[in-house]
Structure formats: structure tokens, C-alpha cells
């Protein structure tokens, strides 16, 4: 299954992916030569009780959501993501030597309750 | 890195593996033959900025907590299962026939934030 | 100044219920675990209850567990003790404070506000 | 939950004597314990987080020491500002819980 895709004004109160562009210049992030920004996206949402197969969940979360529903003191499953990417980056090290490598887990290609 | 590991008593604030025993038969899943419960552990706790080496996360994860010290309109990271493991089921399907099979996802073996 | 104000007390009757509301100013509440601890007439100081910084986990004493709820609201950068089936033996001054979180470990109050008396008597 | 419990309740100290507060916990609460000062209408005050690390603002005269199950407070030189309500609380493990206090008072 491949989770919800929502966009920045969407109503939905389930767990979706959301558009998010990340912009290294504006943190300060001055040892990354390449790309200057990109595009990251990131999790949102309830996982609420019963988890429902679109929300793309894992079985531990499945029994979780379950226990949640009875003993609030145990959280419920989280949104996060399921799938992600990387990125190939151009950036300077801790040695002052400039790097190309692909850097992984950098974008959320899915979201889900896990 | 391996996160952290809390009882049930631990006043720690961050990400944290707690102990989670799951009883079958208290929920009414009568079709799983065996085991009647198992140890399903779960993940609880903040995921605060900085994001720490130990708190076993993804690259998106510490670039989403910067975007989020900055605009809280972006959540925090999650604190999630990053490993997890099966465990063997004895249960009816949904043709009454007994199933013998590894169940993946069923417990978690180690958090962090995601 | 770093302050916290907290409001909301008063005289109940057993098994009545109260909210208690806790104001923070000059500092972020948000960004801090909070907790409410109570001092009986004369007596010791008792931890009450425990919210984290996302408000997600909230910690309780056995003796208030499943009759007071800790929330916060963080656009209005409040805190709030809703106390239900109140007993004489919860009368008590009710402070709010603010945790350091010493070691990322909940329990270390730095911010104390002034208390708001609660009352349980017939 | 683990009882903390404080000897002696009551203090008699003169002024610029040392005094020293005992804090016991039932079982170990590693370094996770601290000093709160209490004057009489006044709210708790943090004196010392970690066992033995000062708060913002706090005299050099107040000294924590101690981990485990066994931990002191000491005041090296009493001034009359001193004397007040002192209470130890752990922070090692649900529920929070405080000592019954020792109260210092001028002698």
C-alpha cells in the first residue's frame, strides 16, 4: 500500500505525506555547496483506532493502536515515514575537502503508522 | 547506534524501547492459537532538538526537527520502532484452516526517531 | 521576568471538581515539561503530575491517577489541572513548575509559581 | 515507589555554624536527586539538581554530595537567610517523590 499524499490546505486528519522544501541557506547550512534546497516532505496524522490498510501500517502498530484503545497510557502508533530516498549532495567536510556522495534518508517518499 | 532502553518506572524524557507484553485472549483474538501473549515492546517519548546521535535517527529526521525549531507548524520527528522483528503464530485463517507462519513487524526491537 | 501565575482554586465539595490554569510569561511554556506539585496545610511537598513538552505523554500519582488530567494548551501558553471527584484529602496549595529536565530526565523544578489554594470540604 | 526520608526533622544551628541534612532514599536513585529550600510562605526554591550541581544563582555556601541511597546537604556557613524548610525529592523514577523535610532553625 502506498499511504495518503496530501497537500499543504488539505482537511485530511488521517496520516499523509505533506510537501515540505527544506532551504539549507536559510538554516546557516553554508558546508553545502549542492543542492541548495530540496525537496524533503514529511509526515502528518492520526492513526487512529482501527488503523485501516490505506494508512499503510505495520502489525506491531496494528496492535498497538489496540492496546492504545484500552490503556491510553500506551501511545498510539505515530505517523512517520515508510519509505524514504536519498539525495546526492555536494558539500564540504570536516576537513575542508568538498564531497559528492548520495546522502540517504533525506526524503519521504511514503508515510505511515508505525 | 542502538537508542535507548527504559522500564516502565524511567523518568527519561527522550525516545526510549519500553517493555510491552500483549495479551491475545484479553482482546478477544481468539483465532491465534499460540503464543497467547508475547513481548511487543513500544516506542515513547520526545525526539527534542538538537536531535542526539543516540536517539538513533534518520537524516530527514534531524533536518524536519530544524524546520520545526523554526516553524512549529512542521512536527517534531516521531519516536518510532527502526527495528523490529517477526514472531512465530499458530492461527485459523479465514477458511478456518491452522496456520503455521512468521509474522513480521510483531516487536520492536529498537527506537529512534523518525 | 520569568513567571508563572497560577488560578482556578477555591472551596468544592467532595466529589465535586475543579480546573486549575497555570499562565507562563517570559518564557516559552512550550518548550518545557511541565508539572504540578501540591503542599497540604502545614504539611510536605507531593508531586502530582507530569505533561511533556509535546504534550503527548502525561505522567500521574497514584493517589490522582484517573481523577485529575494534566493538558496544555500551547497557543495560549497555558497549562491545566482538571481535578474530578475531588476528596478532602486533595486540599492542598497547588503550585505549577517548570522542569529543567536535569539529564533529559523529568523531576527537576527551577520555576515555581505562587499556588492556588484548593479546598475540599462539606 | 521509593520513600525518601530525611534526617534530622528538625535542625538547631547557630548562625555561621555548618550545617549538614541527610536525605535517604529505599532504593538507589543514582545521581537524580534534588535540594529544594522552602522559607515560610515563600515558594520552593531549587538549591542543587544532580546531586551535587548548584543551581543559577545559588551560594557557593550549599554543597550536594552523595548517590545511591545516601546524600547530604551542606550549608558551610548558616546566614540568617538560611533558615528554612529544606526537602530532598528523587527524580529517578515514577512516581516523583519527596522527602518529609528538615526544617533549620536558628539556635
Known amino acids: 500500500d502506498f499511504g495518503l499524499d496530501c497537500d499543504e490546505h488539505s482537511t485530511e486528519s488521517r496520516c499523509c505525506r505533506y510537501p515540505l522544501t527544506v532551504d539549507f541557506e536559510a538554516f546557516g547550512w553554508d558546508w553545502i555547496i549542492a543542492p541548495k534546497r530540496y525537496k524533503a516532505n514529511y509526515c502528518s496524522g492520526e492513526c487512529p483506532f482501527p488503523l485501516a490498510d490505506h494508512l499503510n501500517s505495520t502489525n506491531h502498530a496494528i496492535v498497538q493502536t489496540l492496546v492504545n484503545s484500552v490503556n491510553s497510557k500506551i501511545p498510539k502508533a505515530c505517523c512517520t515515514p515508510t519509505k524514504m530516498s536519498p539525495i546526492n549532495m555536494l558539500y564540504f567536510n570536516g576537513k575542508e575537502q568538498i564531497i559528492y556522495g548520495k546522502i540517504p534518508a533525506m526524503v519521504v517518499d511514503r508515510c505511515g503508522c508505525s | 547506534d542502538f537508542g535507548l532502553d527504559c522500564d516502565e518506572h524511567s523518568t527519561e524524557s527522550r525516545c526510549c524501547r519500553y517493555p510491552l507484553t500483549v495479551d491475545f485472549e484479553a482482546f478477544g483474538w481468539d483465532w491465534i492459537i499460540a503464543p497467547k501473549r508475547y513481548k511487543a515492546n513500544y516506542c515513547s517519548g520526545e525526539c527534542p532538538f538538537p536531535l542526539a546521535d543516540h536517539l538513533n535517527s534518520t537524516n530527514h529526521a534531524i533536518v524536519q526537527t530544524l524546520v520545526n525549531s523554526v516553524n512549529s507548524k512542521i512536527p517534531k520527528a516521531c519516536c518510532t520502532p527502526t527495528k523490529m522483528s517477526p514472531i512465530n503464530m499458530l492461527y485459523f485463517n479465514g477458511k478456518e484452516q491452522i496456520i503455521y507462519g512468521k509474522i513480521p513487524a510483531m516487536v520492536v526491537d529498537r527506537c529512534g526517531c523518525s | 521576568e520569568v513567571q508563572l501565575l497560577e488560578s482556578g482554586g477555591g472551596l468544592v465539595q467532595p466529589g465535586g471538581s475543579l480546573r486549575l490554569s497555570c499562565a507562563a510569561s517570559g518564557f516559552t511554556s512550550i518548550t518545557y515539561a511541565m508539572s504540578w506539585v501540591r503542599q497540604a496545610p502545614g504539611k510536605g511537598l507531593e508531586w502530582v503530575s507530569a505533561i511533556s513538552v509535546s504534550g503527548t505523554n502525561t505522567y500521574y500519582a497514584d493517589s490522582v491517577k484517573g481523577r485529575f488530567t494534566i493538558s496544555r494548551d500551547k497557543s495560549k501558553n497555558m497549562l491545566y489541572l482538571q481535578m474530578n471527584s475531588l476528596r478532602a484529602e486533595d486540599t492542598a496549595v497547588y503550585y505549577c513548575?517548570?522542569?529543567?529536565?536535569?539529564?533529559?530526565?523529568?523531576?527537576?523544578?527551577?520555576?515555581w509559581g505562587q499556588g492556588t489554594m484548593v479546598t475540599v470540604s462539606s | 515507589e521509593i520513600v525518601m526520608t530525611q534526617s534530622p526533622a528538625t535542625l538547631s544551628v547557630s548562625p555561621g555554624e555548618r550545617a549538614t541534612l541527610s536525605c535517604r532514599a529505599s532504593?538507589?536513585?543514582?545521581?537524580?536527586l534534588v535540594w529544594y529550600q522552602q522559607k515560610p510562605g515563600q515558594v520552593p526554591r531549587l538549591l542543587i539538581y544532580g546531586a551535587s550541581t548548584r543551581a543559577t544563582g545559588i551560594p557557593a555556601r550549599f554543597s550536594g554530595s552523595g548517590s545511591g541511597t545516601e546524600f547530604t546537604l551542606t550549608i558551610s556557613s548558616l546566614q540568617s537567610e538560611d533558615f528554612a524548610v529544606y526537602y530532598c525529592?528523587?527524580?529517578?523514577?515514577?512516581?516523583?517523590?519527596f522527602g518529609g523535610g528538615t526544617k533549620v532553625e536558628i539556635k
Open positions: 513548575a517548570k522542569d529543567l529536565l536535569h539529564n533529559w530526565k523529568y523531576g527537576t523544578f527551577d520555576i
Open positions: 532504593q538507589s536513585v543514582d545521581s537524580n
Open positions: 525529592q528523587q527524580y529517578n523514577k515514577w512516581p516523583l517523590t
